[in-house]
């Protein structure tokens, strides 16, 4: 069973910074398209977390394609290391707080929250259910914690820590955002199976977060939510990345990881390991 096909790897805090995509298309696989030209282009590889060269056929493909290495880096990479402390100490908001609301391309419209830079507050918006950008939060509290200026001159960061304006110390904050040493996979993995509104009976899998396993369900063919996968393997890849727990104060993290490099579900929520 592929569910058991896992190995335990010890990762130090400095090895794997958070994968925070500036644009959802940076998570797309390199796509050479159907045409036969040989054109040198660049794409962002979410596994190596670097911009790499690939050969583009000259037509179609996707947005994860750039004329130059510099353009790719500009669109898809950021200085991940120590970014949270840096932005916190400088009392800056993460870059994505300044992005416009983006409903994405899907049509499973749900209520989400974004930071409205014009009004300087978090507001609800109509989200299509996939893609979009990182200025997109499940709860108002999460949006406020990450993007709004906190009280008393605090800037709250997105890992549940805040800078104390009085003594410059980092103090834990009880928030609904993921804590530093827990893994929270894509948010849709926590939603119940939703067969949708149409009349088909397609075999799909959803992640049951209560039992921690992928289970089959019948999908109607439209609507529903993103906890919906065509195979058990795809479901496991997206949702059962395993919990990450703090082993010691030295910051070692134990994580269940797949042996093979496998395609991940494309979405901005795809955040792997969080560390300071």
């Amino acid at each position: 069973d592929s569910e058991e096909d896992e190995e335990h790897t010890i990762i130090t805090d400095t090895e794997l910074p958070p994968l925070k995509l500036m644009h959802s298309f940076c998570a797309f696989k390199a796509d050479d398209g159907p045409c036969k030209a040989i054109m040198k282009r660049f794409f962002f590889n979410i596994f190596t977390r670097q911009c790499e060269e690939f050969i583009y056929g000259g037509c179609e493909g996707n947005q994860n394609r750039f004329e130059s290495l510099e353009e790719c880096k500009k669109m898809c990479t950021r200085d991940n290391a120590n970014r949270i402390i840096k932005t916190t100490l400088q009392q800056e908001k993460p870059d994505f707080c300044f992005l416009e609301e983006d409903p994405g391309i899907c049509r499973g419209y749900i209520t989400r929250y974004f930071y409205n830079n014009q009004t300087k507050q978090c507001e609800r918006f109509k989200y299509g259910g996939c893609l979009g950008n990182m200025n997109n939060f499940e709860t108002l509290e999460e949006c406020k914690n990450i993007c709004e200026d906190g009280p008393n001159g605090f800037q709250v960061d997105n890992y549940g820590t805040q800078l104390n304006a009085v003594n410059n110390s980092l103090t834990p904050q009880s928030t609904k955002v993921p804590s530093l040493f827990e893994f929270h996979g894509p948010s849709w993995c926590l939603t119940p199976a939703d067969r949708g509104l149409c009349r088909a009976n397609e075999n799909r899998f959803y992640y049951n977060s209560v039992i921690g396993k992928c289970r089959p369900f019948k999908y109607s063919g439209c609507g529903g939510n993103e906890n919906n996968f065509t195979s058990k393997q795809e479901c496991l890849r997206a949702c059962k990345k395993g919990f990450i727990q703090r082993i010691s104060k030295g910051g070692l993290i134990k994580t269940k990881r797949k042996r093979k490099k496998q395609r991940v579900k494309i979405a901005y929520e795809e955040i792997f390991v969080k560390n300071m």
């Epitope: 499973g108 209520t111 409205n116 014009q118 507001e123 918006f125 108002l140």
Partner: antibody
Framework: EVQLVQSGAELKKPGASVKLSCKAS????????MHWVRQAPGQGLEWIGE????????NYNEKFKTRATLTADKSTSTAYMELSSLRSEDTAVYYC????????????WGQGTTVTVSS | EIVLTQSPATLSLSPGERATLSCSAS???????LYWYQQKPGQAPRLWIS???ILASGVPARFSGSGSGTKYTLTISSLEPEDFAVYFC?????????FGQGTKLEIK
């Protein structure tokens, strides 16, 4: 005191259009969503759409997207809803209601405008 | 869209009795996004309960709300004459926002 005052009753023929108004006072018009909800005689409530006047953000119920047009005039703090290609089943009381930008609590409602569609 | 089904359609009770109104959603709705409105004849609806259980300003404590997922309930512990009205549940978790068809609470 927050008030939403709606325009008067309308009698329209099938195929015509109607434009309803909702004048807001007592709060910052641009800082809230304005919703339009209708209620057919003896029926439940049906959400038509919402507009946030400051940036002109609008969300429609797909059912009404092709026939309803929501607009807002910031200078007069008035929201408008135009419904085209009227049919008899559009006969209803149309309400405007405001809600905050963070939730959907429609805490203040207009008095309603009765629209009758009849040949 | 999420369909909200309220039951019963009409509830006939006497003052002093306990009333239980149900609202069932076709798909799961977060409790934060489930509201109730009260409407009396010839009037606009009034916000009554937000976030499943938070009473709006001026709503008496005999009202309470509960539920999660697809099942929600509005309860009135001891009916007063002014409580007789139509109650609508409302969800804003998914677009389009939807209302139940209403439960008419009438005097027996």
């Amino acid at each position: 005191e927050v008030q939403l005052v709606q325009s008067g009753a309308e009698l329209k023929k099938p195929g015509a259009s109607v434009k309803l108004s909702c004048k807001a006072s007592g709060y910052t018009f641009t800082s809230y969503w304005m919703h339009w909800v209708r209620q057919a005689p003896g029926q439940g409530l049906e959400w038509i759409g919402e507009i946030k006047p400051d940036q002109g953000r609008i969300n429609y119920n797909e059912k009404f997207k092709t026939r309803a047009t929501l607009t807002a005039d910031k200078s007069t703090s008035t929201a408008y809803m135009e419904l085209s290609s009227l049919r008899s089943e559009d006969t209803a009381v149309y309400y405007c209601a405001r809600s905050s930008v963070v939730d959907e609590a429609m805490d203040y409602w207009g008095q309603g405008t009765t629209v009758t569609v009849s040949s | 869209e999420i369909v909200l089904t309220q039951s019963p359609a009409t509830l006939s009770l006497s003052p002093g009795e306990r009333a239980t109104l149900s609202c069932s959603a076709s798909s799961s709705v977060s409790s934060s996004y489930l509201y109730w409105y009260q409407q009396k004849p010839g009037q606009a609806p009034r916000l009554w309960i937000s976030g499943t259980s938070i009473l709006a300003s001026g709503v008496p404590a005999r009202f309470s709300g509960s539920g999660s997922g697809t099942k929600y309930t509005l309860t009135i512990s001891s009916l007063e004459p002014e409580d007789f009205a139509v109650y609508f549940c409302h969800q804003w978790s998914h677009y389009p926002f939807t209302f139940g068809q209403g439960t008419k609470l009438e005097i027996k």
